[in-house]
């Protein structure tokens, strides 16, 4: 059996954050937007993703993983330089691929100690180990030695979720719900709200059946759909009220455009 090193590696035990706010808990705030942000997790001594609501919260919130690491991880920039110069890599770079307990099919990258390169793998969405990076770039910076690797090909950044075959973006039906494709659909300039409110309902890639709501820009209303539990997009709200609060405000009420209020 492949036994993984613990997430609580001993080398990390004595680390102290650079700033007091790095010790604060992730705070999504009272608002209901869904903004991908990062915070420093005192328990794992890593910067991790969380969903920020868009207002209030605290200082332990960063727009990028890199910014979080630079701000809160002692010696991070030195470590990155070390890795780039072919010196020591963090121990977790040598952990074997671990897809984790769940099956959510997320595209991630890991450092392969056999090939000495960062490679794509499919992460299940929960647990796993720390040899797991959201971007190829981040994996290369931390674990790969660029001196020995070929020039990176500019890779198109796919969505976070791996799908089987081609993804249909403009769906006319999702979970048997007809998404109206009518002339009443507001053009982008008629909608000043959050861009994900214009996305079609996306049931995702797992097998659960969870009641969610999506904003239908054609009707200006929030409709129910079944979410499978992972994947999908940000036009996905746990209640109709949250959906309306998040998306309805961006609609410009212009009768001549035929947009339903």
């Amino acid at each position: 059996l492949s036994e993984e090193a613990d997430d609580t590696d001993s080398e990390l035990g004595s680390m102290k954050p650079l700033h007091t706010f790095c010790a604060m808990k992730a705070d999504d705030g009272p608002c209901k937007a869904m903004i991908r942000s990062y915070f420093f997790n005192m328990y794992t001594h890593q910067c991790e993703e969380f969903i920020y609501g868009g207002c209030e919260g605290n200082e332990n919130r960063f727009d990028t993983l890199e910014e979080c690491k630079k701000t809160c991880i002692p010696g991070y920039e030195k470590t990155a330089v070390k890795a780039a110069s072919g010196a020591e890599r963090p121990d977790f770079c040598f952990l074997e691929e671990d897809p984790g307990l769940c099956r959510g099919y997320m595209k991630r990258y890991l450092y392969n100690n056999q090939t000495k390169q960062c490679e794509r793998f499919v992460y299940g969405g929960c647990l796993g180990n720390r040899n797991n990076f959201e971007t190829l770039d981040e994996c290369k910076k931390i674990c790969e030695n660029p001196v020995h690797s070929p020039s990176p090909v500019n890779e198109v950044q796919m969505s976070d979720y791996v799908t089987d075959g081609n993804t249909v973006t403009d769906r006319s039906t999702v979970n048997n719900i007809v998404v109206p494709q009518s002339p009443k659909v507001p053009r982008r300039r008629d909608y000043r709200g959050r861009p994900w409110c214009l996305q079609p309902a996306d049931s995702g890639l797992c097998k659960a059946s969870e009641r969610r709501f999506y904003y239908n820009s054609a009707t200006g209303k929030c409709h129910r759909f079944n979410y499978t539990g992972c994947g999908g997009n940000n036009n996905n709200f746990t209640t109709r009220r949250r959906c309306l609060r998040s998306c309805k405000t961006g609609l410009i009420k212009n009768k001549s455009k035929g947009v339903v209020k």
Epitope: M34, L101, R103, Y227, G229
Partner: antibody
């Protein structure tokens, strides 16, 4: 319907090895949509997760740090079961031991449990 | 380890009345898209635990709709809209954001 049937001795002497087996029906130990765990329960510790194994093209395991040096969880694909071995037991290991299935596809939780085995560590 | 703290530890209830149990985690269990890595279990007297709620707010198969889970981040609530006699037992929350998987200490629900 998935069923987990536990077997093994209810009394173990201190310093010896606790061995329990969990026989699976209605699923496969090498299914890539499940993981198999041991959890114990005692009045002093409550529910305590001990470890888990799962198959995703190869076998993986994870153990709780509190028992890591003493625990082994192994699959037996021929008998469709998995086992727990806990070495060098002390009276603090006295507990009800449960095997459980982690549903990796839908629930992302322990959705099936064995009947529990009370193991007493005493000389 | 992520510490899960439940309150109250004991909850006397009247059949037909609502009941509410709180669970607080020492770090955020929010993943994304409103998914929280938190489950609720019920252990009826003399039985093994059973899964009630997964991912914070989704009822497991066969669980009556009087049970509902809510909350996000570090604060979660399990509600029973109208308690029935068969709902007695110990309720546990459990996180799976990081290893080791950890459970709350349990809330014992009993009929007054």
């Amino acid at each position: 319907e998935v069923q987990l049937q536990q077997s093994g001795p209810g009394l173990v002497k201190p310093s010896q090895t606790l061995s329990l087996t969990c026989a699976i029906s209605g699923d496969s130990v090498s299914s890539d949509s499940a993981a198999w765990s041991w959890i114990r329960q005692s009045p002093s510790r409550g529910l305590e997760w001990l470890g888990i194994i799962y198959y995703r093209s190869k076998w993986y395991n994870r153990y709780a740090v509190s028992v890591k040096s003493r625990i082994t969880i192994n699959p037996d694909t021929s008998k469709n079961q998995f086992s727990l071995q806990l070495n060098s037991v002390t009276p603090e290991d006295t507990a009800v031991y449960y095997c459980a299935r982690w549903h990796s596809d839908k629930h992302w939780g322990f959705d099936d449990w064995g009947q529990g085995t009370l193991v007493t560590v005493s000389s | 380890d992520i510490v899960m703290t439940q309150s109250p530890l004991s909850l006397p209830v009247t059949p037909g009345e609502p009941a509410s149990i709180s669970c607080r985690s020492s770090q955020s269990l929010l993943f994304r898209f409103g998914i929280n890595y938190l489950n609720w279990y019920l252990q009826k007297p003399g039985q093994s635990p059973q899964l009630l709620i997964y991912k914070g707010s989704n009822r497991a198969s066969g669980v009556p709709d009087r049970f509902s889970g809510s909350g996000s981040g570090t604060d979660f609530t399990l509600k029973i809209s109208r308690v029935e006699a068969e709902d007695v037992g110990v309720y546990y929350c459990q996180q799976y954001t990081s290893y080791p998987l950890t459970f709350g200490q349990g809330t014992k629900v009993e009929i007054k």
